[in-house]
């Protein structure tokens, strides 16, 4: 049929509560495209009917809500003028939310799932709510190892929980809570995330920082091999993650059919006070659908990318 | 590091109840489902339920449903797993053990608790 | 509820073979879900494999554990004296939670 297949990576989820799923691919999706959802290759494409359970609204497929026989594979078909791409989503569905019982419950966390407070310190944990317009969020209640928070070092701000002078007992599991109106029918969303506390030492704070790249472009010739170095400066007690991502997904993930564009081995180099982390990108081969797209270097709640640009032509040449 | 420490070995008339006791340190009490399991001399395990120390939800095998009931003391960081109208099938060793969240299987047990149903 | 009978009962093997032990589900099990413990006489059991193949804490490499839906299998490539005791299979998938029986891996 002529479409480019994507894997994308895995969602673990909760049901009985809703979901949803935007299909984006930038630079795809930021053209004149149509979006077509489909389940388990099926040529039936998802509903759009509103009424309708699971449908699609607009670029998003959406579960209201989502039920335990949900799980597989969806696929979201990118039409453009002269592209057709499709990319494909795996949905595991999980019956039990842990404060019920530990039985079926979240058998791995992602990074969505995990959260870090930084000890002594004013911080926040955020509630990933990602719904189409369509959903009304109402306001946001937080739960620690099952009961609901309350006490003044705690404030909800938006899809926030600001907490105040972090202390050791602030680890533990939370759940966000909010209730989703869509055509006038009310649901439960539910959210874990699992909570550890880290140390600031004295280097630069607790936030990694990361030296390169800064946001920024990078012109490279179409074909040519590149290697992108990030490099992070942390504490040296830090528990923060390092790596590479595009479309908020791993890029060996991303790329785990062709191995095309890979993250390197993580190196670091130890100073008194701090450590310097090196994680690299590498383009085996820059290609077409490369340009545009924000490769993204996470180091904990830092976030750099770099965007891939043809090189201006060289009118000299003529 | 992480210990669940049980109460130690009962005999006990048949009818009559037992209170078996498990004592956590080394991590956050209240973040953990806490369970428990049944062994009886020469036999598999055999799970009875679980109860949650923060919010003390119980979960129990039906097989044990009336007759189990499980407990908490959040100030002393110790689980509680009764069992009463004994019979002498109820002759066993009784383990607690713990289950993080996202890590559902037990990776720590407390070390049992011999409970002799005898007239 | 969901049924886990594990074979054989009895292994009877000599350190330095290979022993491999069966785990079947009356219904199907997420391979996550599904664990296998170690217990040598008067202790209590100890986590051997977690999520069908990952080996917890301190275990040695000789141990792996294969599976999915009906079928698992830990598998032991040589036999070491420390390992002769009984293996337990148990699904954490749904309530209530189930064990095998058990296999007793003994010295022949």
């Known amino acids: 049929d002529g479409c480019k297949d994507i894997f994308m990576k895995n969602e673990i989820l909760s049901a009985s509560q809703p979901f949803a799923f935007n299909c984006t691919f930038p630079p795809i999706t930021s053209g004149e495209v149509s979006v077509t959802w489909y389940k388990n290759s099926s040529k039936i494409p998802v509903s759009k009917i509103i009424q309708s359970r699971i449908h699609q609204d607009e670029t998003w497929i959406l579960f209201l809500p989502m039920e335990w026989g949900d799980s597989g594979v969806y696929q979201c078909v990118i039409k453009g003028r002269d592209s057709c791409h499709r990319i494909h989503v795996n949905l595991t569905v999980f019956e039990k939310h842990w404060c019920d019982t530990s039985i079926g419950g979240l058998p791995n966390l992602s990074d969505e799932y995990k959260q870090i407070l930084h000890l002594g310190k004013d911080d926040s944990l955020t509630c990933h709510l990602h719904f189409p317009k369509s959903c009304v969020l109402g306001p946001i209640k937080w739960y620690k190892d099952c009961n609901e928070i309350k006490g003044e070092r705690f404030t909800v701000l938006e899809t926030r929980l600001l907490v105040s002078n972090v202390s050791a007992e602030d680890r533990g599991n939370y759940a966000c809570q909010a209730i989703l109106t869509h055509s006038g029918k009310q649901y439960e969303v539910l959210n874990g995330i699992t909570v550890s506390i880290t140390e600031r030492a004295g280097y630069g704070g607790s936030v990694p920082k990361i030296i390169y790249p800064k946001n920024h472009s990078i012109e490279v010739q179409l074909g040519t091999t590149l290697i992108v170095d990030c490099n992070v400066t942390d504490t040296k007690d830090n528990t923060n993650l390092r790596c590479w991502r595009v479309n908020n997904t791993l890029v060996d993930d991303y790329y785990d059919e062709s191995k095309r564009i890979r993250e390197g081995v993580e190196t670091h180099v130890s100073f008194r006070e701090h450590n310097l982390y090196t994680v690299n990108i590498t383009f085996l081969e820059v290609k077409m659908e490369d340009y545009g797209l924000p490769f993204m270097c996470h180091a904990g709640v830092s976030t750099a990318y770099i965007i891939l640009q043809l090189p201006a032509p060289d009118f000299r040449a003529y | 590091q992480v210990q669940l420490v049980q109460s130690g070995a009962e005999v006990k008339k048949p009818g009559a109840s037992v209170k078996v006791s498990c004592k956590a340190s080394?991590?956050?009490?209240?973040?953990?489902?806490m369970h428990w399991a049944k062994q009886a001399p020469g036999q598999g395990l055999e799970w009875i339920g679980e109860?949650?120390?923060?919010?003390?939800?119980?979960n129990y095998n039906q097989k044990f449903q009336g007759r189990v009931t499980m407990t908490r003391d959040t100030s002393i960081s110790t689980a509680y797993m009764e069992l009463s109208r004994l019979r002498s099938d109820d002759t066993a060793v009784y383990y607690c053990?713990?289950?993080?969240?996202?890590?559902?299987?037990?990776?720590?047990w407390g070390q049992g608790t011999l409970v002799t149903v005898s007239s | 509820e969901i049924v886990l009978t594990q074979s054989p009962g009895t292994l009877s093997l000599s350190p330095g073979e290979r022993a491999t032990l069966s785990c079947s589900a009356s219904?199907?099990?997420?391979?996550?879900?599904l664990h296998w413990y170690q217990q040598k006489p008067g202790q209590a059991p100890r986590l051997w494999i977690y999520?069908?193949?990952n080996r917890a804490t301190g275990i040695p490499d000789r141990f792996s554990g294969s599976g999915s839906g009906t079928d698992f299998t830990l598998t032991i490539s040589r036999l070491e004296p420390e390992d002769f005791a009984t293996y337990y299979c148990?699904?954490?998938?749904?309530?209530?939670?189930?064990f095998g029986q058990g296999t007793k891996l003994e010295i022949k």
């Open positions: 080394g991590y956050t009490f209240t973040s953990s489902w």
């Open positions: 219904s199907s099990v997420s391979s996550s879900y």
């Open positions: 053990a713990r289950v993080d969240y996202g890590k559902p299987w037990f990776a720590y």
């Open positions: 109860i949650h120390p923060n919010s003390a939800k119980t």
């Open positions: 999520s069908t193949s």
């Open positions: 148990q699904q954490f998938q749904s309530s209530p939670l189930t």
